[in-house]
Interface confidence: low
């Protein structure tokens, strides 16, 4: 009889435990940190907070707070058991507190415009200063009852740390609650209110007739000028100058969920979404070993291109990153970090035909943006949780 | 068509145990959370017990906390309820059910605890 | 663990009147609420789920209201076949509860 555990199939020092009951035949007993049938998956230490539906448990990006899950398919809630909202006006409603609700059509589909009492201002009238919203404000966890802008978006809990991204746009001109509606507004279209999502331009996205093939063609090494355009994506910043050293300028480091079995795909939808989504070209950045700047989160490389500081209890609780990226793990979701190159040539008031945010900074603000109105998940293969901007420089080698 | 049916009910002394079983079809089985709910006869529902998608995280009601097992077997689109040190309170029709709006319930089985 | 409470435990009503059930947390559960219609010998049977979205195939008489600790489930106009034992649920957090129940009766 053949021994199911004679060929070792416990990573990390898993010790196996032959089982008939068991589909696979044995059992691992993981070490503290991993988890999964073959301890192949690391385990963030979330003691007794749980994600549902195929949700991911990260560690809190501010230290002292709770771990917090990212969501997948829609559900939402601390632990990830919120069903996804209906698209549109539901039912029900996504408008609370007697807020009434107005389909609109926008580049996610179908979306909606909540009308809200004066004392319920949020996107979803929601109440920011309502009963319980004190101490979850900036705990890493958006709680969308209290995200609004009297509330900082729930302490920048909803809008990727970011506390207002309409910072600088004229506060009774409401622009937060036109974002993204797929209505021009004017009044918004400004680089202070973050172009009004983009509803002003025309045309909103990339012809029909083009759309596939700039998709096949997106980021190749060669630039196609029928796919060089803002709503095309600037064919992944394939026709960017030559001029200086682009390879190595701006740049942003996103982290975000994503399904390692299909870990390629998914990054190549990530950039060109990005890209059509803020009107920059947007592609993979790799490092000088050519190899994409994809970093395992958590795990000291992804937190430092973050730019964050670590949890300092968070080294004991769970064993570090020793499994190469290309490995494929038990899990159906693990956190990355992906460094994205950025070509910021064709924004800027020197191309007052092609608003677009002209600096990382801006871009950080616009994704904010959508994050806060609810339009930035659907349109990813995984939620985003943070994004850092960085200036232009020389990446290290890739010691993974 | 989404089914379930339960099976493995029977009469079982005070103290001792019996194992249910909930075979799942119509459905991805692997993709969803399943509970289990138990009705004393007359009385209203209780929720026992429920297991993530993949097994790996379980609850439990108080009541039966450290006496009932629940496990999945996705290979076999099969849920399981491993009951032990069994009571008289114990005694109804158990019930499972997928997610956590109970959409589609199994016909149940009855469990009767009796010396 | 949170406690769910209905009331009235029984409601008499005329086919064709209007029937409120109500069902209380004791502490707040957001919208994480779900209803039940269950009749002698049957497995309950989902009406509303996230306090006040019906569901698949559910008549448009039955609706859900309410949020945090407070929620009602109205039957605008009694059908014969609606006379039954109806639940409440809430799935906020572990372990989840169900209210007792209330029985709608034919006055």
């Known amino acids: 009889e053949i021994d199911p555990c004679h060929s070792q199939p416990c990573f990390h020092g898993g010790t196996c435990e032959a089982t008939a009951g068991s589909p696979l035949g044995f059992i691992c007993h993981c070490p503290k940190g991993f988890e999964g049938p073959t301890c192949s998956h690391r385990a963030p230490s979330c003691g007794f907070h749980h994600c549902h539906h195929g949700g991911l448990c990260l560690p809190s990006p501010k230290p002292g707070f709770p771990p917090r899950c990212a969501c997948l398919s829609g559900y939402g809630g601390p632990d990830c058991l919120t069903p996804p909202a209906p698209k549109g006006c539901g039912p029900p409603s996504p408008c609370l507190y007697n807020g009434s609700c107005s389909e609109t059509t926008g580049l996610g589909g179908p979306g909606f415009r909540c009308s809200c009492p004066h004392s319920s201002p949020g996107p979803r009238c929601q109440k920011p200063g309502a009963k319980g919203c004190e101490g979850r404000s900036g705990d890493g966890a958006c709680d969308a009852g209290c995200s609004g802008p009297g509330g900082n978006w729930d302490g920048g809990d909803c809008s990727l740390g970011v506390p207002d991204p309409w910072k600088g746009c004229p506060s009774h001109s409401r622009c937060w609650l036109l974002f993204r509606d797929g209505q021009c507004h004017p009044q918004c279209d400004s680089e202070e209110c973050l172009f009004d999502g983009y509803d002003c331009e025309t045309p909103p996205a990339c012809t029909p007739a083009y759309d596939q093939y700039c998709h096949d063609h997106f980021h190749n090494g060669h630039c196609e000028k029928g796919c060089n355009t803002a709503e095309c994506g600037w064919d992944g910043g394939d026709c960017r100058p030559e001029d200086g050293d682009p390879e190595w300028g701006p740049s942003l480091a996103l982290l975000v969920v994503l399904s390692p079995p299909a870990l390629d795909q998914q990054l190549f939808a990530l950039a060109r979404v990005l890209s059509l989504t803020l009107r920059v070209g947007l592609w993979v950045r790799k490092d000088r070993d050519g190899r994409d700047m994809v970093y395992p989160y958590p795990g000291a490389r992804a937190e430092e291109k973050l730019g964050g500081t670590r949890d300092p209890t968070y080294q004991e609780r769970a064993a570090p990153q020793t499994q190469p990226l290309g490995k494929e793990t038990d899990s159906l979701s693990a956190g990355f970090v992906v460094v994205m190159g950025v070509d910021l040539s064709r924004c800027g008031p020197d191309h007052p035909a092609s608003r677009c945010p002209w600096d990382p900074g801006l871009l950080l603000r616009f994704l904010a943006a959508m994050a806060a109105v609810g339009a930035l998940e659907p349109l990813l293969p995984g939620p985003l949780l943070a994004v850092h901007p960085h200036a232009g420089t020389a990446p290290p080698a890739n010691q993974l | 068509e989404v089914q379930l049916v339960e099976s493995g009910g029977g009469l079982v002394q005070p103290g001792g145990s019996l194992r249910l079983s909930c075979a799942a079809s119509g459905f991805t089985f692997s993709s969803y959370g399943m509970s289990w709910v138990r009705q004393a006869p007359g009385k209203g529902l209780e929720y026992v017990s429920t297991i993530n998608s993949n097994g790996g995280r379980t609850y439990y009601a108080n009541s039966v906390k450290g006496r009932f097992t629940i496990s999945r077997d996705n290979s076999k689109n099969t849920l399981y309820l491993q009951m032990g040190s069994l009571r008289a309170e114990d005694m109804a029709v158990y019930y499972c059910?997928?997610?956590?709006?109970?959409?589609?319930w199994g016909q149940g089985t009855l469990v009767t605890v009796s010396s | 663990e949170i406690v769910m409470t209905q009331s009235p435990a029984t409601l008499s009503v005329s086919p064709g009147e209007r029937a409120t059930l109500s069902c209380k947390a004791s502490?707040?559960?957001?919208?994480?609420v779900a209803w039940y219609q269950q009749k002698p010998g049957q497995a309950p049977r989902l009406l509303i789920y996230w306090a006040s979205t019906r569901h698949t195939g559910i008549p448009a008489r039955f609706s859900g209201s309410g949020s945090g600790t407070e929620f009602t489930l109205t039957i605008s106009s009694l059908q014969s076949e609606d006379f039954a034992v109806y639940f409440c649920?809430?799935?906020?957090?572990?372990?989840?509860?169900f209210g007792q129940g209330t029985k709608v009766e034919i006055k």
């Open positions: 502490q707040d559960v957001g919208t994480a």
């Open positions: 059910a997928r997610d956590q709006g109970f959409a589609y």
């Open positions: 649920q809430q799935y906020s957090s572990y372990p989840w509860t």
